[in-house]
Interface confidence: low
């Protein structure tokens, strides 16, 4: 069962997925000049068996210099859902991934792929948060939210963090109520995850021992 | 191999403002938070505040209305004032490197030799 | 405020056995928690993080583990070195410190 909407927007921070349930689609998007090839696969798919997952289908971009149009091919109104979006840097690495069963790991880049990655998460993922460069948690429950299913209908858990930072005013844990979301930022806002050279993160989930390693900037 | 140092004057009088430096040698001041810890003689720890090399700052509650950090990043220098001091101010004051990993973040891995204020007349 | 809480205050063991240090939050700190050792007239050097990781150039004779208010730190095997006054922080809301275990020599 797909997620009907995208996980929380929490201020001055980012979410990840440090593994993928199966049943996740990821859009093959091309960069601005390029397109998914004619025969190819509209999306990957986490798939597998009880001791084995990967992605099926493979994206595949070639230059569409040779036709009158960069217009992005996308998956159809009836493949789409609702779209998913994490904006990451191509060349993301991971370091030290344990297999989780069920699960997919992030699907290294295909050439010529566009910057944003549209994932459409499922039932039981989970995406894990933490605050930008320059910002730092200070109220913190669990930074992570579930896309859960309750009375039919899909809805994400609140990760329990408020990032602060660039001087703004500070409040004791209880004084104030975690921000859900960027104040005046549209449901379609996605969190921006883009390459700078001078600041790395480490972030040890430890629900999944799972730990990757990036760069990031807030844009 | 990055050390903390540090500096200001050992003895500061009742209702007079604290002032001390911390100079960061063997490595930059950037992309690391900086905290103030202090340690009242035989007793725990307690933070006092941080600051990150853009200027952004956070302080202990219970200190905040006294408590100003700043950073000088031209110098590798952050500095402590701690206004209208008592005799309860009289501590062992620390810098110290703030880890930086992701949400899971606020820990020391360096700490300054430390430095005795006494607030007394 | 999470309030810390270590026990024992003062702790004797005879260098090569082994010791074990507690600390309690007031309520849940996830995994977010840390151990210093501090030795008279000396700052701070962390020991463990993440309630269960050895920093850098600690010895494997040191470990953490526990999660959420229980926190226990181990030292399988004392060394002459080890005596020291150990400080438990937790980092899950703002900072914390415990007030301090004495480890002496028996």
């Known amino acids: 069962e797909l997620c009907d909407d995208d996980p929380p927007k929490i201020t001055h921070a980012t979410f990840k997925a440090v593994a993928y349930k199966e049943g996740t689609m990821l859009n093959c998007e091309c960069k601005r000049g390029f397109r998914r090839i004619k025969s190819g696969s509209p999306y990957m798919l986490c798939t597998g068996n009880s001791s084995h997952s990967s992605w099926d289908n493979q994206c595949q971009c070639t230059s569409s210099a040779a036709r009158n149009t960069t217009k992005q091919v996308t998956p159809q109104p009836e493949e789409q859902k609702e779209r998913k979006t994490t904006e990451m840097q191509s060349q993301m690495q991971l370091a030290d991934q344990v297999s989780l069963p069920g699960h997919c790991r992030e699907p290294p880049p295909w050439e010529n792929e566009a910057t944003e990655r549209i994932y459409h998460f499922v039932v039981g993922q989970t995406v894990y948060y933490q605050c930008v460069q320059g910002y730092r948690a200070l109220h913190r429950g669990p930074a992570e939210s579930v896309c859960k299913m309750t009375h039919g209908k899909t809805r994400w858990t609140q990760p329990q963090l408020i990032c602060t930072g660039e001087t703004e005013p500070s409040q004791f844990p209880g004084e104030e109520e975690p921000q859900a979301s960027p104040d005046g930022l549209p449901e379609s806002e996605t969190s921006r995850l883009v390459t700078t050279t001078d600041f790395r993160i480490q972030t040890e989930v430890a629900a999944t021992m799972e730990t990757f390693i990036f760069t990031t900037e807030y844009q | 191999q990055v050390q903390l140092q540090e500096s200001g004057p050992g003895l500061v009088k009742p209702s007079e403002t604290l002032s001390l430096t911390c100079t960061v040698s063997?490595?930059?001041?950037?992309?690391?938070?900086w905290s103030w810890i202090r340690q009242p003689p035989g007793k725990g720890l307690e933070w006092i505040g941080y600051?990150?090399?853009?200027?952004?700052?956070n302080y202990n509650p219970s200190l905040k209305s006294r408590v100003t950090i700043s950073v000088d990043t031209s110098k590798n220098q952050f500095s402590l004032k701690l206004s209208s001091v008592t005799a309860a101010d009289t501590a062992v004051y620390y810098c110290?490197?703030?880890?930086?990993?992701?949400?899971?973040?606020?820990?020391?891995?360096?700490w300054g030799r430390g430095t005795l204020v006494t607030v007394s007349s | 405020e999470i309030v810390m809480t270590q026990s024992p205050a003062t702790l004797s063991v005879s260098p090569g056995e082994r010791a074990t240090l507690s600390c309690r939050a007031s309520?849940?700190?996830?995994?977010?928690l840390a151990w210093y050792q501090q030795k008279p007239g000396q700052a701070p050097r962390l020991l463990i993080y993440?309630?269960?990781t050895r920093a850098t150039g600690i010895p494997a004779r040191f470990s953490g583990s526990g999660s959420g208010t229980e926190f226990t730190l181990t030292i399988s095997s004392l060394q002459s070195e080890d005596f020291a006054v150990y400080y438990c922080?937790?980092?899950?809301?703002?900072?914390?410190f415990g007030q301090g275990t004495r480890l002496e020599i028996k």
């Open positions: 110290a490197r703030d880890i930086l990993t992701g949400y899971s973040d606020w820990f020391f891995d360096l």
């Open positions: 063997g490595g930059s001041i950037r992309s690391y938070y």
């Open positions: 600051i990150y090399y853009s200027g952004s700052t």
């Open positions: 309520q849940s700190v996830s995994s977010n």
């Open positions: 993440g309630a269960s």
């Open positions: 922080q937790q980092y899950n809301n703002w900072i914390t």
